[in-house]
Interface confidence: medium
């Protein structure tokens, strides 16, 4: 029970320490916003995370919290400060009446307030049949003693640290922040409480059934015995990791978050801060057979988000639900009937399923890669995970039709050799959120901070779009796609690459008016063409009869419709060379593709001509895909002729650097 007088003493002190000008207005023109979980049953009203502006100091956070308490007390409300955040995000966690939100939003330094909500373990079911001894052969998977230089933090349930699979490999920290269990008939049973976390620790680093057998782990308890936690508890856990990292810097850190809740601005922000501090975060996509972008931390762009597939490369079905999907998923990994440590006894094994298990596989692979190359950045690691994945093996028919193009068809795999990938030019495709259907709607796709945007394309299911352009935003290039009148919305598609010492710029040619079409080329010395984009203001590009194909011997040139402005992405980087590859089909075709050869990487993907029956262009791995309207609606006129244009690049500099190392 609580000491009531203690609470009031704190309030009285707060009142005394503040001046009379308590209701100080926030900085002019700024309005703090309130956010809450879109999934009503997961809401936890009465507890709020007050997030302060980025540059707020700890002392200001404490003062703001006291100010809130003082103002609330004047109105007869009791409040309780549960935690003051610093290290990751400035702010505080407060228990208070919802009636005080309006007041709290007006406090100085407040950026936004988020109501607390639940997060859940992402494994189903927690106990199937016990398997003792384990149902696998020890000689099937015996990688080198991988991951020994890496520390993996697990934010999950409590764990059975003396299980023979993980004994001596997992350090149980003293961190615990969990809600009480629900329900009237719940009995805490140690084996149930430890079930989820023990299994995942085993999948990551277990002696027999682990991926990275050399990795050491640290566990934080943020999920209760029912596998339930809170956004606020997870935030405090992430802050704990950041503080540990600052106090005692070690080698590379991987943080495994095998949990999911509704979309949370604050949880995503905390993940972003931790990722930018050099920590690799891996999370479960979620088990809701839904768009992963609706969940957190799965929707955080800086986090590696993992969906689940089974042994037949089918997306995992879990009861009536299954793995999440969509553009927020980075890749898939095994997540059905995964054998691992069972908390029922110290030598027991059990199989569990879910995106938690899939995320644990990727955390193990990441630990192996980082142990082999400790200097890898998050962007480099993510690109390598994508590069070494098995491509195009997932049966996409399981996904809703509108999500198939957005969902990566990638299943995580260990690299054939942990060294020697340095010469490769790595690129990945990043899809934006959907723009929405309004006439002037746009969609923006962004690359990670240390990736280069080498090309930009767009896609619309209705075909009504006004193209795309690369533009500067906050000192970085972004890819922006434009919807057209009557369109159902567009996607922007960025091609994001790792290109050290690159200097890239965009050259634009306005609509040509002349009948030969618009052209633009890379005119700076040493700059090569990596991508072409086109954007038009007219609602519907007419058919463009004159040829718009590139004249031979002019590879550094983008061409397009005379009514469109054309944008060329031109880059200079040591040893970078690129070539244009085209595949034109004279007859109308719903899909035209062109791929880059072995040793070359697709950096740009666009369509010629840019007429309205072309739905758009996008890169899938090393293949440029151009989609057109249903052939039956276009007829077999010359308008149906479409050319897919790929720009393929390689870096002789990276190849040489790699050879020198070997």
């Amino acid at each position: 029970q609580e000491d009531e007088d203690g609470d009031y003493e704190e309030l009285v002190l707060a009142l005394r320490s503040e001046e009379d000008g308590l209701a100080e207005a926030p900085e002019h023109g700024t309005t703090a916003t309130f956010h809450r979980c879109a999934k009503d049953p997961w809401r936890l009203p009465g507890t709020y995370v007050v997030v302060l502006k980025e540059e707020t100091h700890l002392s200001q956070s404490e003062r703001t919290a006291r100010r809130l308490q003082a103002q609330a007390a004047r109105r007869g409300y009791l409040t309780k400060i549960l935690h003051v955040f610093h290290g990751l995000l400035p702010g505080f966690l407060v228990k208070m009446s919802g009636d005080l939100l309006e007041l709290a939003l007006k406090l100085p330094h407040v950026d936004y307030i988020e109501e607390d909500s639940s997060v859940f373990a992402q494994s189903i079911p927690w106990n199937l049949e016990r398997i003792t001894p384990p149902r696998y052969r020890a000689d099937e998977y015996q990688p080198p003693d991988g991951g020994s230089l890496v520390e993996v933090y697990l934010l999950d349930t409590s764990i059975q640290s003396d299980h023979r699979e993980i004994e001596g490999r997992v350090m149980v920290t003293d961190f615990e922040n969990v809600p009480e269990e629900d329900g009237t008939r719940f009995h805490r049973q140690a084996s149930k409480c430890d079930s989820h976390g023990t299994h995942l620790a085993g999948v990551v680093s277990g002696r027999d059934a682990g991926v990275a057998k050399g990795a050491s782990m640290r566990s934080l308890r943020v999920l209760n015995c029912q596998g339930k936690g809170t956004v606020s508890g997870t935030l405090i856990g992430l802050e704990f990791i950041r503080k540990s990292q600052l106090v005692q810097p070690v080698g590379p850190l991987v943080v495994l978050l095998p949990l999911a809740g509704g979309y949370s601005r604050v949880l995503n922000a905390a993940c972003q801060r931790l990722a930018r501090a050099g920590v690799v975060l891996v999370t479960a996509a979620g088990n809701f057979r839904d768009d992963a972008c609706l969940y957190s931390p799965a929707s955080a762009p800086e986090v590696i988000t993992v969906g689940a597939t089974n042994a037949q490369d089918q997306p995992v079905t879990l009861g009536t639900l299954g793995t999440n999907f969509g553009r927020c998923v980075d890749l898939f990994a095994p997540g059905e009937d995964i054998i691992g440590a069972s908390s029922d006894c110290s030598t027991c094994f059990v199989s569990q399923s879910g995106t938690s298990q899939a995320a644990a596989h990727v955390a193990g692979i990441a630990a192996m890669m980082l142990s082999a190359e400790p200097e890898l950045t998050l962007a480099e690691l993510r690109q390598r995970l994508i590069h070494f994945s098995a491509k195009d093996v997932i049966n996409e028919a399981w996904f809703p039709e509108d999500q198939r193009v957005l969902t990566p068809n990638l299943v995580a795999a260990l690299p054939p050799s942990t060294h020697g990938a340095g010469w490769q030019l790595f690129c990945r495709t990043v899809w934006s959120a959907h723009s929405g259907p309004t006439r002037m709607a746009t969609a923006v796709a962004r690359c990670a901070p240390d990736e280069e945007l080498l090309s930009c394309s767009s896609f619309s299911r209705s075909g009504k779009r006004r193209g795309e352009r690369m533009e500067a935003q906050g000192g970085k290039l972004v890819c922006r796609a434009h919807n057209a009148f009557g369109g159902e919305g567009v996607y922007a598609i960025a091609r994001c690459c790792l290109l050290p010492q690159a200097n890239c710029s965009v050259h634009t040619a306005p609509p040509a008016e002349a009948s030969m079409g618009t052209r633009v080329h890379c005119h700076q010395q040493g700059h090569v063409l990596t991508g072409c984009s086109s954007h038009w203001e007219v609602e519907d590009l007419g058919t463009h009869k004159p040829p718009v194909l590139r004249p031979r011997g002019q590879p550094n040139q983008c061409v397009g419709h005379r009514e469109a402005s054309i944008h060329a992405s031109c880059c200079h980087a040591p040893g970078l060379e690129c070539k244009v590859k085209e595949h034109g089909i004279p007859a109308p075709q719903e899909q035209v593709t062109v791929a880059c050869e072995e040793g070359w990487t697709l950096t740009g993907c666009s369509a010629l001509p840019g007429t309205s029956h072309v739905l758009g262009a996008y890169a899938v791995d090393n293949t440029c895909v151009v989609r057109s309207r249903d052939v039956s609606t276009t007829g077999s006129t010359s308008e149906g002729a479409v050319t897919a244009v790929a720009i393929c690049c390689r870096s002789r500099h990276l190849a040489q650097a790699s050879q020198e190392l070997q």
Partner: nanobody, 126 residues
């Protein structure tokens, strides 16, 4: 220091009635919710009913609706639970609890109530 004290428990025949009282002493905040919970042997504590500080707004668990009535004496800071048509399955220790951080919605979660009384035993014989 706020203290909650329950009284009024006892032994009663099935179909009978009891009136439980919860008296709050000390300084309570201006806004709060008082809830009644019960716990039978070997079972988790469960929500029974709750009332806001004004006494005007109440909430009940499905299994007691129409049989139990929660009310508040604003002068004496006492909350009552009138229990009618009692059944053997109503036998439990009844606890009074205070939620000092009320939200627009009532909460039936044990964890949202942060001050508790010692409890009073109610036994309904068949």
């Amino acid at each position: 220091q706020v203290k909650l004290e329950e009284s009024g428990g006892g032994l009663v025949q099935a179909g009978g009635s009891l009136r439980l009282s919860c008296a709050a002493s000390g300084r309570t905040p201006r806004h709060y919710i008082v809830g009644w919970f019960r716990q039978a042997p070997g079972k988790e504590r469960e929500f029974v009913a709750a009332v806001r500080e004004s006494g005007s707004s109440t909430e009940y668990a499905e299994n007691v609706k129409g049989r139990f009535v929660i009310s508040k004496d604003n002068v004496k800071s006492t909350v009552f639970l009138q229990m009618n048509s009692l059944k053997p399955e109503d036998s439990a220790v009844y606890y009074c609890a205070l939620d000092r951080f009320p939200t627009p919605e009532f909460s039936d979660r044990v964890g949202h109530y942060d001050l508790w009384g010692q409890g009073t035993q109610v036994t309904v014989s068949s």
